[in-house]
Interface confidence: low
């Protein structure tokens, strides 16, 4: 109630002779600050004096007097909250009641605290969980109701007297609620820890033994078993007997049932500690163990691998991989159930023994077509030889072999013929499914592997074919050797390099681009007349009469080819000039007379000049000289001159006679 002072501290504190006591304490006075504090040992209230009697361990007064005991006993509090005390060292006769006499200005209070000091260090207390199971982590707790700042201690865990290697966590409490030192150890006990002694040892700061507590571990665990087999190596032959014995080396709690397992499956009607197998068969090979159960669960022994030996069973062959591609590697594996494992193998290819092959695997690094066929094997161990199984088939695949392109036509082939070719091969696996031809053309393939070329061209040189299955194999190209008449025949002027002038030396060449066969003949022709049979046509001194249209022909055994007509043009100065007169060389005066300068020239005359009988040039320059009206005095001899780019030519004199008209004569 509100008339009391309020104190908080542990009810009882524990220590031993020579140690110390630390008393955590708090208070709240009724009014004002603390003015006086006395610590009594076993205080008694004296009704006569209305005061407390007893040993004064500590005294704090206004005048500040302190008894000599104050060095051992210390008040660590203050005037309004803290009443913590320390006694160091503490003695056996300090056991009893401590009385804290507190006085403020107007109020007084006596607070009692119990102190229990033993002669020797008291033991800690080990706390265990209610049940411990193997491999399940548990926490072991060691508790000591003591802690004091002036007296360090340590708690150590021991298993069968040996320090435990697991790390313990130590904690201390010095509070108004509790004073203790505690060590906690996390630990996963194994079945082998069952019945072992665990100790918590109290030691001083130097590791000196002070006291301890011990407990015996009760570790619940499944039965622990040992299995024994006769014969000891568990290797027998068919028809032999085997005995297996199961021994329980530890079980907590006691075991309840026994059973035997083979390859993880329980064997029926086998519920004793001995398993007798009489006249074993190879099917009884396997892993055996015994299983014994208790309330925790089943325990299993190690497995015994019982091996019933027998001669190899009929073998099978596994091929990696079939079909195989030529040139690849292939591995054959002989598989035969046997115990002991086969030590020797015999291999057969198409029924014939393969020499030098005695391993379970046969490796062929580079497969060839002849490797195809049936492979079988026989396995052998110390108990006998197995039978040959059905074998496995190796299919070796390869591109078509020895592919050739064959011309079916009679030779030679001529331009325009129809040519038939076939694509042949020696062998193929898988079968040929298609053919390819080079070069590509608009050709017919009337049947698989046959090519028809209609109207073969002169320039069809070579053809190659490929036969294809999963791969294509190309044949070497075959030459068609098409024969044809000479091609591109033309006339070419070799000399002169410029225009041909009359009198020049001239050479014409008959050219062609190609001919098959190469042996040819030449023919020159002008206006349907044969001129020569050489490749060249030569003129030592060309004349205008040689001009004209020339052709050359080139002949081989297939045919002949003519060039386009080639025009030979000869340039020459005007020649054969003459003056012609119209209407005649005798004209009546007053009429019209026309003189024409006729000539032969190449190129044509470009310029004319007229002359009279006095060789006087006349002011006329056209081909015709027109006199109108003609006069008697025009009578006389005339000539003309023609000019072209090559030169000049002149005509002979031609006489014009102009006679008088009847009128003129009549006037005379």
């Amino acid at each position: 109630d509100s008339s009391k002072w309020v104190f908080e501290h542990p009810e009882t504190l524990y220590a031993w002779e020579g140690a110390c006591v630390w008393i955590p304490c708090t208070y709240r006075a009724l009014d004002g600050d603390l003015e006086s504090f006395i610590l009594f040992h076993n205080p008694e209230y004296n009704k006569n004096t209305s005061k407390f009697d007893g040993t004064r361990l500590y005294e704090s007064t206004k005048d500040g007097k302190v008894p000599s005991e104050q060095k051992r006993v210390q008040f660590l509090g203050d005037k309004n909250k803290n009443c913590t005390l320390s006694i160091h060292p503490v003695h056996l006769n300090d056991s009893g009641q401590l009385g804290l006499r507190m006085e403020s200005k107007t109020e007084k209070w006596m607070e009692r605290i119990h102190l229990n000091v033993s002669e020797r260090p008291f033991p800690p207390h080990i706390q265990l969980p209610p049940e411990i199971q193997e491999s399940q982590e548990v926490t072991l707790t060691c508790l000591l109701n003591f802690s004091c700042y002036g007296y360090p201690i340590q708690l150590q865990w021991l298993l069968e007297g040996v320090p435990m290697r697991q790390a313990a966590v130590t904690s201390t409490s010095l509070t108004i609620k509790s004073v203790f030192t505690r060590s906690e150890l996390k630990f996963s006990p194994q079945w082998s820890h069952h019945g072992k002694i665990v100790t918590c040892q109290l030691q001083d700061a130097d590791g000196k033994f002070l006291s301890n507590d011990t407990v015996q571990l009760n570790v619940k665990h499944t039965p622990k078993l040992e299995i024994k087999v006769t014969p000891s190596d568990a290797i027998v032959r068919e028809g032999d007997s085997v005995t297996m014995t199961c021994e329980v080396s530890s079980s907590n709690p006691e075991y309840t049932t026994v059973s035997w397992l083979k390859d993880g499956t329980s064997l029926k009607k086998q519920n004793t500690f001995t398993l007798n197998l009489r006249e074993v068969t190879k099917d009884q090979s396997g892993k055996y163990c015994c299983q014994v159960s208790n309330d925790v669960g089943p325990g299993r022994s190690e497995e015994v691998f019982l091996q019933v030996q027998y001669a190899p069973e009929p073998s099978t062959v596994q091929i990696l991989h079939s079909p195989a591609v030529e040139g690849s590697q292939v591995e054959f594996l002989c598989m035969s159930l046997a115990n002991p494992l086969p030590t020797n193998y015999t291999w057969y290819h198409n029924g014939k023994e393969m020499q030098g092959r005695t391993e379970e695997k046969v490796h062929i690094p580079k497969i060839l077509p002849w490797h195809a066929g049936t492979y079988s094997c026989v396995a052998e161990n110390i108990l006998g030889t197995g039978q040959r199984g059905p074998g496995a088939e190796l299919d070796v695949q390869y591109p078509p072999k020895k592919v050739t392109t064959v011309i079916q036509n009679p030779m030679p082939i001529r331009e325009g013929d129809t040519v038939t070719l076939s694509c042949n091969y020696n062998s193929s696996n898988p079968s040929v499914t298609r053919y390819e031809w080079k070069p590509h053309g608009a050709w017919e393939e009337p049947s698989l592997g046959v090519l028809k070329i209609q109207n073969v061209g002169w320039d069809n040189t070579t053809i190659a074919c490929a036969a294809c299955n999963s791969w294509c194999s190309w044949a070497s190209p075959v030459a068609l050797n098409v024969q044809y008449a000479p091609r591109d025949v033309r006339v070419r002027k070799i000399k002169p390099l410029s225009e041909i002038h009359s009198g020049n030396s001239v050479s014409l060449q008959c050219d062609f681009s190609s001919s098959h066969p190469k042996e040819v003949q030449f023919f020159w022709e002008k206006n349907g007349r044969l001129l020569g049979k050489e490749s060249q046509l030569n003129f030592d001194s060309i004349s205008p009469e040689d001009a004209g249209s020339y052709s050359c022909w080139v002949n081989n055994s297939i045919g002949q080819t003519a060039s386009k007509a080639w025009t030979l043009e000869v340039l020459y100065a005007p020649r054969r000039l003459r003056v012609s007169m119209s209407p005649g060389d005798q004209v009546m005066e007053g009429k019209s007379a026309t003189l024409t300068c006729e000539s032969d020239a190449n190129p044509p005359v470009s310029h004319y000049t007229w002359f009279d009988w006095n060789n006087q040039s006349l002011p006329y320059h056209s081909q015709k000289l027109r006199l109108e009206p003609v006069k008697v005095q025009h009578s006389g001899a005339y000539w003309c001159q023609g000019t072209n780019s090559v030169g000049k030519g002149r005509s002979p004199l031609s006489t014009l006679t102009v006679y008088y008209s009847p009128e003129t004569i009549g006037r005379r």
Epitope: K287, F305, C334, P340, L341, T343, I382
Partner: nanobody, 126 residues
Framework: QVQLVESGGGLVQPGGSLTLSCAAS????????MTWVRQAQGKGLEWVST????????NYADSVKGRFTISRDNAKKTLYLQMTSLKPEDTAVYYC???????????????????WGRGTQVTVSS
């Protein structure tokens, strides 16, 4: 003299892979069935896998089936154990052992074998 020397062990994270090798010398390797045995700390020997003389037959403990592959190279006189999808419970010292019996032999007892290696430590931990 006869020697079996294991190598390839080490620290690996769970789910990781390692390949152990066992180099043989001083005896005719190809005549011997070869076995891997392991021992976790504080536990007994545990049979892991066995391979026949030619390498065609092999056998595995249930705990490693589908994760471990045993193989041998008679030309190189070497035994291998390829370990994948490793688990913390695979942590152990791995030994290779050989015997002259011509059959698949499963045992974790040391005296059942003709020759025994010194072991290589495999630790599976994150």
């Amino acid at each position: 003299q006869v020697q079996l020397v294991e190598s390839g062990g080490g620290l690996v994270q769970p789910g990781g892979s390692l390949t152990l090798s066992c180099a043989a010398s001083g005896f005719d390797f190809s005549f011997y069935t070869m076995t891997w045995v392991r021992q976790a700390q504080g536990k007994g020997l545990e049979w892991v896998s066995t391979i026949s003389t030619g390498g065609g037959g092999s056998n595995y403990a249930d705990s490693v089936k589908g994760r471990f592959t045993i193989s041998r190279d008679n030309a190189k006189k070497t035994l291998y154990l390829q370990m994948t999808s490793l688990k913390p419970e695979d942590t152990a010292v791995y030994y290779c052992a050989s015997h002259r019996r011509g059959y698949m032999f499963v045992s974790s007892r040391k005296n059942e074998y003709d020759y025994w290696g010194r072991g290589t430590q495999v630790t599976v931990s994150s």
